[in-house]
Interface confidence: medium
């Protein structure tokens, strides 16, 4: 017989020879990182027809790492379904908890023993320190020292000492989030008051009032013979200025060579699209917890 078969999990005991006599026996042992479980044979014999009797390495099993339990308030997931060396164990924490330690352990071979690459991690409860205090305002649960995951606080503004109220700029409600930080920056309480918007040769058609506070919205149209240069809708923004700027009503030219803009009485529609649903002096209704303040 020629050289005996080779296997992934099993190796020849002794040096192989180029040829073997009929009836000659060779023995195998499990390779490093594998261990033998009887009863399958680990030897073969050179048969009379010059072939080796059937033999397999199915009795050699990969070394296994010790079983690791799910961490408290988390889960250990085997990436490839077994604890054999080469395995990966992934750790995740339940909602409201964060991982301390490595999120993946590897089953490695040290000498002939399969061991994990490190200590299993822990899942600790997500906690936040109290949210920021704000000038001219307060938040709920101000006496609480530690907040748990998803605990929320609501900010409100104090009554103003003068005639104009404080407006809340930003998110009124923030919550303790994934990485032990608050979901948004604390809002600001300040007096936001825009100047009375005067449009010569035009008139206000909505948003009437003597005072214009945060998010106050005013709409205009021009007198007959004038067209609107700018937006027909303006909003009082947090820096006490109108956005977009107060428009102008310009006279429609009667010169036969000049083509005036085709328009209704209020002039061409602006391309600027104002925010939806505003109410003076309050946060936009389209802002709430989980939203982006930087939009």
């Amino acid at each position: 017989c020629e050289a005996p078969p080779t296997f992934e999990a099993m190796e020849l005991i002794g040096k192989p020879k180029p040829y073997y006599r009929v009836g000659e026996r060779v023995d195998y042992k499990c390779k490093k990182g594998y261990f033998y479980i009887p009863p399958l044979a680990t030897h073969t014999i050179c048969d009379r027809n010059h072939t080796w009797l059937p033999v397999s390495d199915e009795g050699c099993y990969r070394e296994m790492c010790p079983h690791i339990r799910d961490p408290l308030n988390g889960e250990a997931i085997l990436a490839n379904g077994s604890y054999e060396f080469g395995a990966e164990l992934h750790f995740i924490c339940n909602e409201g908890y964060y991982l301390i330690g490595k999120d993946i352990l590897y089953c490695e071979l040290k000498d002939t023993v399969a061991i994990w690459s490190g200590k299993p991690p822990l899942c600790e409860k997500i906690l936040c320190t109290p949210p920021p205090k704000i000038k001219n305002g307060k938040h709920t649960f101000s006496e609480v020292e530690v907040f748990e995951y998803l605990d929320a606080v609501t900010y409100s503004c104090d009554p103003a000492p003068g005639p104009d109220p404080f407006s809340l700029i930003g998110e009124s409600m923030i919550y303790c989030g994934n990485n032990s930080t608050w979901s948004h920056a604390a809002p600001e309480c300040k007096v936001v008051k825009c100047r009375f918007p005067v449009v010569e040769n035009g008139k206000q058609i909505s948003g009437f009032g003597k005072k214009f506070y945060y998010k106050a919205t005013v709409m205009f149209e021009c007198d007959k013979g004038y067209y609107l240069n700018g937006s027909d809708k303006i909003v009082c923004e947090s820096n006490s200025t109108w956005d977009p700027p107060v428009p102008k009503c310009l006279k429609v030219s009667t010169s036969p060579t000049t083509k005036s803009p085709t328009s209704s009485a209020s002039g061409p529609r602006p391309t600027y699209k104002p925010p939806v649903s505003n109410y003076p002096g309050y946060p936009k209704p389209d802002e709430g917890i989980l939203n982006n303040l930087d939009d």
């Epitope: 998803l150 609501t154 409600m173 989980l290 939203n291």
Partner: antibody, heavy 116, light 109 residues
Framework: QVQLVQSGGGVVQPGRSLRLACAAS????????MHWVRQAPGKGLEWVAV????????YYADSVKGRFTISRDNSKNTLYLQMNSLRAEDTAVYYC?????????WGRGTLVTVSS | QSVLTQPPSVSGAPGQRVTISCTGS?????????VHWYQQLPGTAPKLLIY???NRPSGVPDRFSGSKSGTSASLAITGLQAEDEADYYC?????????FGGGTKLTVL
Amino acid sequence: QVQLVQSGGGVVQPGRSLRLACAASGFTVNNYAMHWVRQAPGKGLEWVAVISYDGNNKYYADSVKGRFTISRDNSKNTLYLQMNSLRAEDTAVYYCAKGGGYFDLWGRGTLVTVSS
Amino acid sequence: QSVLTQPPSVSGAPGQRVTISCTGSSSNIGAGYDVHWYQQLPGTAPKLLIYGDNNRPSGVPDRFSGSKSGTSASLAITGLQAEDEADYYCSSYTSGTWLFGGGTKLTVL
């Protein structure tokens, strides 16, 4: 025009899956938290799921946890609700809604009927 | 069974004032979380009516007002009109969950 246009409803057998879509126009979905709310025939409103503006936080009602997945495709400005292992009690009109603590813009709703 | 409790129905004659109550607990309304109200006209999607306890979005008539005290909130409608006939829902928040009341059907007699 600021609006939410919904699609994807229909009749489906128990145990099967369905995906609802909600296309936004007039604003960008990845600047806002987006929710799904449902209403069973003749019943009240029930909150289903929310995805935060950055997509990092997703919360679900206990009744759908592990079966429904909320997601967003920013390039299409569209919100999705993947509904697996559907049950008869999931039969409802499903609304998508914009906003965080409250919902200031709603889709028109799409009917999902789970029946054998 | 809803976590926020509303009366199933209320009614009033045109021009009258009606109120709809919404009772929660110390873990939602009583914890300081805002209460919001939605109006749902027959066959349509809900519409935001009141946000943050007592604020009206633009376009909502000042006949509608909201208030909150302790673990309860209420919606008041003055000068009742035929077009106010609808279902009304209160809503609030508790850790990781948005809550709705069971809804109240308002009938204008």
